[in-house]
């Protein structure tokens, strides 16, 4: 008499998360009698998945009609598969007894679950950096399977090369996560730039997922300061202009000081944007020269985005010949400068 065989025809089955998995198992004989049980894993720690004799297994249904009297098909269907269901499933025949005795196991069917990666989330640096500095962006995606995955970084459409990527865990797992860091050197023109993290996986059918970050969140473009004096007016008033140009972000406070005393403070708001995303701002100060007997030291002080203040200073000299005036005289553009205005 031929020995009973437990046949699991498929060595492996791959299923997309959310779908149903069919695990096939047939026996070559109804004798000896005894239950068929399905387990995930082998050995003492194996997990009972389905007992065709008794029990409540809401996600598992027999493929064959269990009311067939000569049934030798013990295949099961597991619904709503998740990555946690991955593993090797064994169809095991027991011989009836008290308790039932394991008689023979099938060779096992490895169930792998194809799970889509989550939408990539890109995060940038916690603090802004200025041009020529390098900042790091991180991209994370989770919950995918199988482990093979491709991640690319782009800045304004150009692929970045200074990238470090890790897929965890290194060993076998029901699902995986990817974390990648890209280092980007900032330029003053990067206010409108964008970095893209692109993830390609077998479950995405060639349509990669993308996460983006705007460099505007990471960059600070410090302003240029230029102080100029317009022509002396007939009423002995000098119009001094402080031009603050090419800065980003808009958060900026300008303070005028006369001889070290605050004359006026202004906050930038609702400024028009330059083509490159930066902003310009001009502030005027009228100085009544005749009201001063001594020279007047004017300072344009700019605090940008919480950074230390940048000053431009110059002196207006009270002259015996006030009508002899300079025209469009500019203070220098670096450091703290003083300029004598006649």
């Amino acid at each position: 008499e031929e020995e009973l065989q437990v046949i699991q025809p498929e060595k492996s089955v791959s299923v997309a998360a959310g779908d149903s998995a069919t695990l096939n198992c047939t026996v070559s004989s109804l004798i000896p009698v005894g239950p068929i049980q399905w387990f995930r894993g082998a050995g003492p720690g194996r997990e009972l998945i389905y007992n065709l004799k008794e029990g409540h297994f809401p996600r598992v249904t027999p493929v064959s009609d269990p009311t067939k009297r000569n049934n030798m098909d013990f295949s099961i269907r597991i619904s709503n598969i998740t990555p946690a269901d991955a593993g090797t499933y064994y169809c095991v025949k027991f011989r009836k007894g008290s308790p039932d005795v394991e008689l023979k196991s099938g060779a096992g069917t490895e169930l792998s679950v194809r799970a889509k990666p989550s939408a990539p989330v890109v995060s940038g640096p916690a603090v802004r950096a200025t041009a020529e500095h390098t900042v790091s962006f991180t991209c994370e995606s989770h919950g995918f399977s199988p482990r093979d995955i491709t991640l690319k970084w782009f800045k304004n459409g150009n692929e970045l090369s200074d990238v470090q990527t890790n897929v965890d865990p290194a060993g076998k797992s029901v699902s995986y996560s990817i974390r990648s860091t890209a280092r980007v050197v900032l330029t003053r023109r990067d206010v409108h730039s964008q970095v893209i993290c692109e993830v390609a996986h077998v479950t995405l059918q060639g349509d990669p997922l993308r996460g983006t970050a705007n460099l505007s969140e990471a960059i600070r473009v410090p302003p240029f300061l230029e102080v100029t004096q317009q022509s002396m007016r007939a009423d002995n008033q000098v119009n001094v202009t402080c031009q603050v140009t090419k800065f980003y972000p808009q958060r900026l406070q300008l303070t005028w000081l006369e001889n070290g005393n605050v004359s006026r403070t202004e906050m930038a708001s609702a400024l028009p944007e330059n083509k490159d995303g930066t902003y310009n701002w001009t502030s005027w100060l009228l100085v009544n020269v005749s009201a001063h007997r001594d020279d007047v030291k004017l300072t344009c002080q700019v605090e940008h985005d919480g950074q230390p203040a940048v000053n431009k200073s110059f002196s207006v000299k009270v002259s015996a010949h006030p009508k002899e005036q300079g025209s469009n005289t500019a203070a220098e553009n670096t450091g703290t400068n003083e300029r004598n205005i006649y």
Epitope: L30, L52, P66, N70, N71
Partner: antibody
Framework: EVQLLESGGGLVQPGGSLRLSCAAS????????MSWVRQAPGKGLEWVSA????????YYADSVKGRFTISRDNSKSTLYLQMNSLRAEDTAVYYC?????????????WGQGTLVTVSS | SYELTQPPSVSVSPGQTASITCSGD??????ACWYQQKPGQSPVLVIY???KRPSGIPERFSGSNSGNTATLTISGTQAMDEADYYC?????????FGGGTKLTVL
């Protein structure tokens, strides 16, 4: 409470036909296989035929194969046995029996039986 | 085809233990069921899967099955247990019954 009620028995001449019915109640009819078992006067039980819950699989004893047809109407919770080319040896009380529902099912409920007499 | 053999009759005194046997080739590898049939009544399942008792069946009914023989045991037999008893191999597409055993309670 599970109930099985057979009907359709009677006297029929050899070579004639008869259709037995079994009306079921008290359980989900489509979830269980059903069988016909007969008992000739003063004799033992003889299994005749079985049908799976969906009706897709049918089984017959060699003694009735080709002459009897088992069927079911799950919408009416009714089991049938169409008996053709009847012979004297088919004379018996015919019981309809419900399978227990496991993979090795006993007959856990039986009807009261209907007598079929084949005689000229 | 598979055959099951039962003794045609068994006698027992009230209160004693009655044993009814059912023999078949490697019957112990199969599940045995037992039915009780009283005169003029339909059969009633008393034992299934060798040893299990359906609800409503008294504890005095028990079963065993190994080798080539299944046994129905009625301990403390009562007069009401007098009936025909049929064994069945409950595992194949064609349900096989034994010839039946008439239990007489003396």
């Amino acid at each position: 409470e599970v109930q099985l009620l057979e009907s359709g028995g009677g006297l029929v001449q050899p070579g004639g036909s008869l259709r037995l019915s079994c009306a079921a109640s008290g359980f989900t009819f489509s979830s269980y296989a059903m069988s016909w078992v007969r008992q000739a006067p003063g004799k033992g039980l003889e299994w005749v035929s079985a049908i799976s819950g969906s009706g897709g699989d049918t089984y017959y004893a060699d003694s009735v194969k080709g002459r009897f047809t088992i069927s079911r109407d799950n919408s009416k919770s009714t089991l049938y046995l169409q008996m053709n080319s009847l012979r004297a040896e088919d004379t018996a009380v015919y019981y309809c029996a419900k399978d227990g529902g496991s993979y090795y099912p006993p007959f856990d409920y039986w009807g009261q039986g209907t007598l079929v007499t084949v005689s000229s | 085809s598979y055959e099951l053999t039962q003794p045609p009759s068994v006698s027992v005194s009230p209160g004693q233990t009655a044993s009814i046997t059912c023999s078949g080739d490697k019957l112990g590898d199969r599940y045995a069921c037992w039915y009780q049939q009283k005169p003029g009544q339909s059969p009633v399942l008393v034992i299934y899967q060798d040893t299990k008792r359906p609800s409503g069946i008294p504890e005095r009914f028990s079963g065993s099955n190994s080798g080539n023989t299944a046994t129905l045991t009625i301990s403390g037999t009562q007069a009401m247990d007098e009936a025909d008893y049929y064994c069945q191999a409950c595992d194949s597409s064609t349900a096989v019954f034994g010839g039946g055993t008439k239990l007489t309670v003396l």
